[in-house]
Amino acid sequence: DTEIKVNPPQDFEIVDPGYLGYLYLQWQPPLSLDHFKECTVEYELKYRNIGSETWKTIITKNLHYKDGFDLNKGIEAKIHTLLPWQCTNGSEVQSSWAETTYWISPQGIPETKVQDMDCVYYNWQYLLCSWKPGIGVLLDTNYNLFYWYEGLDHALQCVDYIKADGQNIGCRFPYLEASDYKDFYICVNGSSENKPIRSSYFTFQLQNIVKPLPPVYLTFTRESSCEIKLKWSIPLGPIPARCFDYEIEIREDDTTLVTATVENETYTLKTTNETRQLCFVVRSKVNIYCSDDGIWSEWSDKQCWEGEDLSKKTLLR
C-alpha cells in the first residue's frame, strides 16, 4: 500500500505590477500530476505583511491571486498543493510548502519619508492630500505623489501639487471616476541632491475620509405651545440624505441647552414660554450605512430667533 504524495506548486512568486501595493501572487501546477488526471487539485495560499501576527488564508483552484499589501513592509507568502479526499481514497493529502518573499529595496533612512500624511475627500467630490517634509531633508527636496485604484491602467502622478517654500507638500486630485468602495493606493517618494529619500505607501478607501459640507437652510417651526421643530437641509452635492448623521448644538438664552446626534434633518425641542432667544448650529458626517468612518463637517451658520415672542406659529429667518 504505497503512500500518496504530491509536490508543491512550481515557480511560486510575488509580482509587483506597479500598482503601489496591489500585488499578484502566482504559481504553476506541481510536477508529476499525471496520477491525478481525474482530480481537481486545490492550493492553500497563506500570505501576510512581515511583522503581522496573522496570515490570510485562501483555498483556490486557480494559479494566481491578487490582493493589496503595505509596501512600507515586506511581504511573505507560502503555498502548498491539496489533493482532496475524493482523489486519495479517503484522506486529504498536502504537499510541503513553497515559500517566497517580496519587498521594495528601501532608499534613504526612515526619517526622510514624509510625515503627517492627511487625505480628505471633500463632500465626496474632491480629494486633497497633504503632508509635512521628512526629517533630515533639505529645502531642495521635492516630493512626488503617485496613485492607483482598480480601474486605472497604471499608476498616475499628481498633476496639481500644493507647494510651500518651493516644495510639494500636497496634491489636489482630479475627478476620480468610480473610485470609492475600493482600495486607493498612494506612494509619496522624493528626490534630493544630497541624500536618498524613503518612499511612503498609504492605502485607504475614499468613502471613509469624506468631509461633507455643512447643512444649510436652518429653520424653526412652532409645533405646539411647548415644542419647536428645528429643520435643515442637506448640503448640495452627491451625498444622499440616507448617508448623513447630524450633530446639533442648541443654545437657549446664552446657555447651552442641548447637544444631540440625529439621523434625519429635524429635531424637536421642548421649550418654555420664558425663552427669549434660541440659536442652533448643525454639522454633518457620513454615517455607518455608507462608510466605516468619516470626518465631521464644519458647523453650519448659526440660526437664531430673538427679541420676539417664540409662541408665533412659524419662525423663519
Epitope: A164, I169, G170
Partner: nanobody, 116 residues
Framework: QVQLKESGGGLVQAGGSLRLSCVAS????????MGWYRQAAGKQRELFAS???????VYAGSVKGRFSISKNNAENTLYLQMDALRPEDTAVYYC??????????WGQGTQVTVST
C-alpha cells in the same frame, strides 16, 4: 497675522547646552505641526526635529540623543533643548509652523555658535 519669534541662541563652548524658544501667534498653535530647521553657512536649510499636534517627535540622526523638541500649548511656545553641542551644530536655527495643509510660516532665525 502669523508671527514666530525665536530666542535663546548665542555662543557656547563645545559640550555645553542651550535652550531655544519660539513664541507663536496668529494661528491655533495646539493643532499645528512644528519643526526646527537649521542653516549652516554656505549650506541649505535642513529640517532636523519636528513635533506633531499630538506630540509625536522625530529627530535626524545627527541630533538624536542630544537635542529634544517640545511644546507648551498653553504658552504657544516651541522649545529646543540642545545638549552636548558640537562645532558642527553652528548654524542659524529657524522655527517652522505648518498649521494647515497649505501654509508654512518661519521665524527670523537665531544664531547658535559652538566654539572648540
Amino acid at each position: 497675522q502669523v508671527q514666530l519669534k525665536e530666542s535663546g541662541g548665542g555662543l557656547v563652548q563645545a559640550g555645553g547646552s542651550l535652550r531655544l524658544s519660539c513664541v507663536a501667534s496668529g494661528f491655533t498653535f495646539s493643532s499645528a505641526w512644528m519643526g526646527w530647521y537649521r542653516q549652516a553657512a554656505g549650506k541649505q536649510r535642513e529640517l532636523f526635529a519636528s513635533i506633531t499636534s499630538s506630540g509625536d517627535t522625530v529627530y535626524a540622526g545627527s541630533v538624536k540623543g542630544r537635542f529634544s523638541i517640545s511644546k507648551n500649548n498653553a504658552e504657544n511656545t516651541l522649545y529646543l533643548q540642545m545638549d552636548a553641542l558640537r562645532p558642527e551644530d553652528t548654524a542659524v536655527y529657524y522655527c517652522n509652523a505648518r498649521p494647515g495643509a497649505v501654509n508654512s510660516y518661519w521665524g527670523q532665525g537665531t544664531q547658535v555658535t559652538v566654539s572648540t
